[in-house]
C-alpha cells in the first residue's frame, strides 16, 4: 500500500490539517490545568494526573492508552526532621541556619505538599568542617584547586555554584577530591539576568529561591536497584550498597541569601582569577575555612532524607499505523515535576497533549498515520530518567526491532529568543525542511519562515547560512532510546539568547517559582512560542510517521563523522611525540569514514531512483535507514559505562548534559599526560580508535546494496 491508501486526505493536506488543528489557546489551557498543584514523582497527585491524561488521550481518539507502572528507588526529605546547614561556633552552638523552605509565591501560600529544596538521593549525615569554595565544581575547577593552588579538599565541606555542568558531575568530582559534604547554591551571576526583576515581578531568581534536583551518576542505568532490567513485580533488587550511581556524601542546595552568609566569612586563598567570582558582595575566597575573626567557626550539614522504593506510572498511548503498524515513532515527555512544573515539564506536557488532540481529530475524520505513533507521559524523570528507562528496558526487544525515531518533549521553553534543536544527524534535513515551512513567531520576522529567524539568531558555527543544531547529550528522557538502544532521536524547544544571557538554564529552574504565571506573564503571554514548538515537535512526528520514504539523510552522518574524526585527531596531535612512540594512527578511522561517505553517497543516489511502488524494496530501503542509527551501537558499551553504547555520541563524562563525539577515544585521551602508565594509556587510545573505526565501517556496510 502507498501511504495515500492509509488516509482519506492527500499527503500534503495531512500535514497542513494536523498543524492547523494545533491551537495556542489549548496549550495555555492545558498548562494551567497541569500546574495548579505539585506533581512530584511517587505521589498520589502525580498518579491522579496520570489517570487524567490517560482518560483525556482516550477521549482525543487514541486506539489505546495504558498505564505502565514500576517500583523504583526515589528519595524524599524527612517531613519531621528537616534538612539544613548551620554555622557553628567553637562550642558547637548553631549561630546561623539556612532556611527550611522557599517563601511560597503569591496565590500559593496555602498549597500543601510543596517539597522543600533538597538534593535527591543524598545520603543522611551530619558532617562538620571547614568550607572550601570550588567554583562550579567542574573537572577543571578541581584541577585548578589541587594542581595549581595545592588546596586539599579531603575532609572538607565544599560549596559549589550551580551552572555549567550537571549537578551530579559536581558531586562526583567533590567525592573524588575527598570532600565529606557538598553545598550547592545559585549565584546571581548565573541565575539573575541584569535588568530583570525577581519573581513575582519578573523572571529572575529571588534570594530565597532554590534549585532542587537529583545528584545521581547513573550513566544511563535507570532505577539504581535494577540496572538493565525493568523494576517490575518480580524484579530482583540490589542492596542499597550495590545500587548504581548513589552519592556517598551528604549534599544540600541553598539560595543566594543563605550562600551570602556562608561565603562572606571565607578566608584562605583568594580566587585564582575573575572566572571564579560570582555577583555576590563576598570575596569568593577559596578557603579552606573562615577568615581570622571567624576561624574557629565551622559549617555543619544536617541531612535526613530517605531513599524509598516507590511506585511510578507512565502513560503510553498508541495510534496504530495503517500501513506499517510494526514501525514505531515515539513522542515522549515527562509529567513529574519538583513543584508546580510551570516550565519543567508542563510546558512540554501541554504541547504533547495538544499534539495528541490534533492527531486524534484527524483520526476521528478517518485518517491514520502510515506508521504507529506512540505517545508517552513519563514519570520520575527528575529522579534519574527512571520512567522512560524502565519502560524501554521492559520493551527493549520491540524497540530495537521496530523503533524508527524518538522525539523528546520536556520543557517547550527555556527562553523566548529562538529555536534550539539537538538531534541525530539523520534528522538534520527533516528539521531544515520543516522549519522552512513554518512561520516564525519572532518579532521582526513577520511573514518570514522559522528557518530564517532561527538561522539569523543562532547561526551554525561552521556556516552562517544555516542554523546551529547541537549534539544530543543527556539529562532527559531520550537518553535510553538514543544512547542505549540506538534509535534516531531529536528534541526542540525555544531558548534564550546565549550571547547576552550567560546564566545557566533559566533562573527559576526547579524552584517553587516555576509557576503557570511565570510563563503566562513573562515568557509567552500569547503562547506563540509554545505553538511553534508544538508545530516543530508535532511536524517531526508527522513526517517520521507518514512519509513514504523515511525522512533521514545518511549523508549528514558522513559529514559529521569526518568533522568528529578531524576534531579527535587534532586533540591527539597535541601529543605528537607520544603518538610516534606508541605508533598511534588514525588511518583506520579516516579510512572507515571515507568508506562510509562513499557508501552513503551511493545509497542516497539509489534512494532517489528506486521503485517506490514496490513495497518490498521500499521496506528494505526504509529498514536500512531505520537501522543505521542502531549500527552505531556497541553491545559492550563504553568503558565503565555499559548503558552508554553509542560509539559516535555519549554524554560527556564531565557534564551529563553535554554530548561528546567519539567519546571512547575522547575519554582515553583526556588528561593523558597525567596518567601514571603512559604505555597503558596510549594502548587504550589505540583500542578505542580500533573500536570506532570498526563501528563506522560496520555501519557503512549496512547501507551497501544488500546482495
Amino acid at each position: 500500500k502507498s501511504s495515500n491508501e492509509a488516509t482519506n486526505i492527500t499527503p500534503k493536506h495531512n500535514m497542513k490539517a494536523f498543524l492547523d488543528e494545533l491551537k495556542a489557546e489549548n496549550i495555555k489551557k492545558f498548562l494551567y490545568n497541569f500546574t495548579q498543584i505539585p506533581h512530584l514523582a511517587g505521589t498520589e497527585q502525580n498518579f491522579q494526573l496520570a489517570k487524567q491524561i490517560q482518560s483525556q488521550w482516550k477521549e482525543f481518539g487514541l486506539d489505546s492508552v495504558e498505564l505502565a507502572h514500576y517500583d523504583v528507588l526515589l528519595s524524599y526529605p524527612n517531613k519531621t526532621h528537616p534538612n539544613y546547614i548551620s554555622i557553628i561556633n567553637e562550642d558547637g552552638n548553631e549561630i546561623f541556619n539556612t532556611s527550611l523552605f522557599e517563601p511560597p509565591p503569591p496565590g500559593y501560600e496555602n498549597v500543601s505538599d510543596i517539597v522543600p529544596p533538597f538534593s535527591a538521593f543524598s545520603p543522611q549525615g551530619m558532617p562538620e568542617g571547614d568550607l572550601v569554595y570550588v567554583n562550579y565544581a567542574r573537572t577543571e575547577d578541581f584541577f585548578k584547586l589541587e594542581r595549581d593552588m595545592k588546596i586539599n579538599c579531603s575532609g572538607k565541606i565544599v560549596i559549589a555554584r550551580y551552572g555549567k555542568v550537571f549537578r551530579g558531575n559536581k558531586v562526583k568530582n567533590a567525592q573524588l577530591a575527598g570532600a565529606k559534604g557538598v553545598i550547592l547554591y545559585s549565584d546571581p551571576a548565573d541565575y539573575f539576568a541584569p535588568g530583570v526583576k525577581s519573581y513575582p515581578d519578573g523572571w529572575n531568581l529571588p534570594g530565597g529561591g532554590v534549585q532542587r534536583g537529583n545528584i545521581l551518576n547513573l550513566n544511563g542505568a535507570g532505577d539504581p536497584l535494577t540496572p538493565g532490567y525493568p523494576a517490575n513485580e518480580y524484579a530482583y533488587r540490589r542492596g542499597i550498597a550495590e545500587a548504581v550511581g548513589l552519592p556517598s556524601i551528604p549534599v544540600h542546595p541553598i539560595g543566594y541569601y543563605d550562600a551570602q552568609k556562608l561565603l562572606e566569612k571565607m578566608g584562605g586563598s583568594a580566587p585564582p582569577d575573575s572566572s571564579w567570582r560570582g555577583s555576590l558582595k563576598v570575596p569568593y575566597n577559596v578557603g579552606p575555612g573562615f577568615t581570622g575573626n571567624f576561624s574557629t567557626q565551622k559549617v555543619k550539614m544536617h541531612i535526613h532524607s530517605t531513599n524509598e522504593v516507590t511506585r511510578i506510572y507512565n502513560v503510553i498511548g498508541t495510534l496504530r499505523g495503517a500501513v506499517e503498524p510494526d514501525r514505531y515513532v515515539i513522542l515522549g515527555g515527562h509529567r513529574d515535576s519538583w513543584v508546580f512544573g510551570g516550565i519543567d515539564p508542563q510546558s512540554g506536557a501541554a504541547v504533547v497533549h495538544e499534539i495528541v488532540r490534533s492527531f486524534g481529530t484527524l483520526k476521528k475524520e478517518g485518517w491514520r498515520p502510515r506508521r504507529t505513533i506512540l505517545f508517552a507521559s513519563w514519570d520520575a524523570e527528575e529522579f534519574g530518567l527512571l520512567g522512560s528507562t524502565e519502560w524501554a528496558e521492559e520493551n527493549s526487544r520491540l524497540l530495537q526491532e521496530r523503533g524508527v525515531a524518538y522525539i523528546n518533549a520536556d520543557s517547550s521553553i527555556e527562553g523566548n529568543y529562538t529555536l534550539r534543536v539537538d538531534c541525530t544527524p539523520l534528522m538534520y534535513s527533516l528539521v531544515h525542511n520543516l522549519t522552512k515551512e513554518l512561520k516564525s513567531p519572532d518579532e521582526g520576522f513577520e511573514g518570514k519562515s522559522l528557518y530564517e529567524s532561527w538561522t539569523k539568531k543562532s547561526p551554525s558555527p561552521e556556516f552562517s547560512g544555516m542554523p546551529r543544531i547541537s549534539k544530543l547529550g543527556s539529562g532527559n528522557d531520550f537518553e535510553v532510546f538514543f544512547q542505549r538502544l540506538g534509535i534516531a532521536s531529536g528534541r526542540a524547544r525555544y531558548t534564550k539568547n546565549w550571547e547576552t544571557n550567560k546564566f545557566s538554564g533559566y533562573p527559576l529552574y526547579h524552584s517553587v517559582y516555576e509557576t503557570y504565571e511565570l510563563v503566562e506573564k513573562f515568557y509567552d503571554p500569547m503562547f506563540k512560542y509554545h505553538l511553534t514548538v508544538a508545530q516543530v515537535r508535532g511536524g517531526m512526528v508527522f513526517e517520521l510517521a507518514n512519509s513514504i520514504v523515511l525522512p533521514f539523510d545518511c549523508r549528514d552522518y558522513a559529514v559529521v563523522l569526518r568533522k568528529y574524526a578531524d576534531k579527535i585527531y587534532s586533540i591527539s596531535m597535541k601529543h605528537p611525540q607520544e603518538m610516534k612512540t606508541y605508533s598511534v594512527s588514525f588511518d583506520s578511522l579516516f579510512s572507515a569514514v571515507k568508506n562510509f561517505t562513499e557508501i552513503a553517497s551511493k545509497f542516497s543516489e539509489r534512494l532517489q531512483d528506486f521503485d517506490k511502488s514496490n513495497p518490498i524494496v521500499l521496506r528494505m530501503m526504509n529498514d536500512q535507514l531505520m537501522f543505521l542509527e542502531r549500527a552505531f551501537i556497541d553491545p559492550l558499551g563504553l568503558p565503565d559505562r555499559p548503558f552508554y553504547r553509542h560509539v559516535i555520541y555519549a554524554p560527556s563524562s564531565h557534564n551529563k548534559y553535554a554530548g561528546e563525539s567519539f567519546p571512547g577515544i575522547y575519554d582515553a585521551l583526556f588528561d593523558i599526560e597525567s596518567k601514571v602508565d603512559p604505555s597503558k594509556a596510549w594502548g587504550e587510545v589505540k583500542r578505542q580508535i580500533y573500536v570506532a573505526a570498526f563501528t563506522v565501517q560496520a555501519a557503512a556496510e549496512t547501507l551497501s546494496e544488500v546482495a
Epitope: S429, F463, M466, R555, D556, V559, K594
Partner: nanobody, 123 residues
Framework: EVQLVESGGGLVQAGGSLKLSCVAN????????MAWFRQAPGKEHEFVAA????????NNADSVKGRFTISRDNAKNRVYLQLNSLKPEDTAAYYC????????????????WGQGTQVTVSS
C-alpha cells in the same frame, strides 16, 4: 579544522573573466573534496562546482557548465574557480567550502567554509 580564505573577486564587465582562489591551512587538504558556492543578494546559497580530493573528478552546476572550471593544486593547498563568459546574473558572493564528497550540492553537507569574495558583473 580547516580554515579557508578566498580571494580574486572584483568588478568585471559582462563577457569578461576572473580567477578565484582559495587557500586552506593544514596538512590534510588533499583528503577533502572542495567546492565553490555562491550567494546572490536575498537568495540562498547555490552550488557552483566541486572537485574530488585528488582532483580527478569534478561536478559542475548546469548553470555554469562550459563557462566555469574548478581545479586544485594540492601542493599549494589551493583550489581555483576560473570564471569565463561572465553574465550579470553571476553577480554574487563566492564561497569556498571543504567537505567529504564532490557530489554533494546542498550547503548543509559541506564542513568548512570561507568568508567569501564578492564578484560583481556589470552589464
Amino acid at each position: 579544522e580547516v580554515q579557508l580564505v578566498e580571494s580574486g573577486g572584483g568588478l568585471v564587465q559582462a563577457g569578461g573573466s576572473l580567477k578565484l582562489s582559495c587557500v586552506a591551512n593544514g596538512p590534510t587538504f588533499s583528503t577533502y573534496a572542495m567546492a565553490w558556492f555562491r550567494q546572490a543578494p536575498g537568495k540562498e546559497h547555490e552550488f557552483v562546482a566541486a572537485i574530488t580530493g585528488d582532483g580527478d573528478t569534478t561536478n559542475n552546476a548546469d548553470s555554469v557548465k562550459g563557462r566555469f572550471t574548478i581545479s586544485r593544486d594540492n601542493a599549494k593547498n589551493r583550489v581555483y574557480l576560473q570564471l569565463n563568459s561572465l553574465k550579470p546574473e553571476d553577480t554574487a558572493a563566492y564561497y569556498c567550502a571543504a567537505g567529504v564528497h564532490h557530489t554533494y550540492t546542498i550547503p548543509r553537507l559541506w564542513l568548512y567554509w570561507g568568508q567569501g569574495t564578492q564578484v560583481t558583473v556589470s552589464s
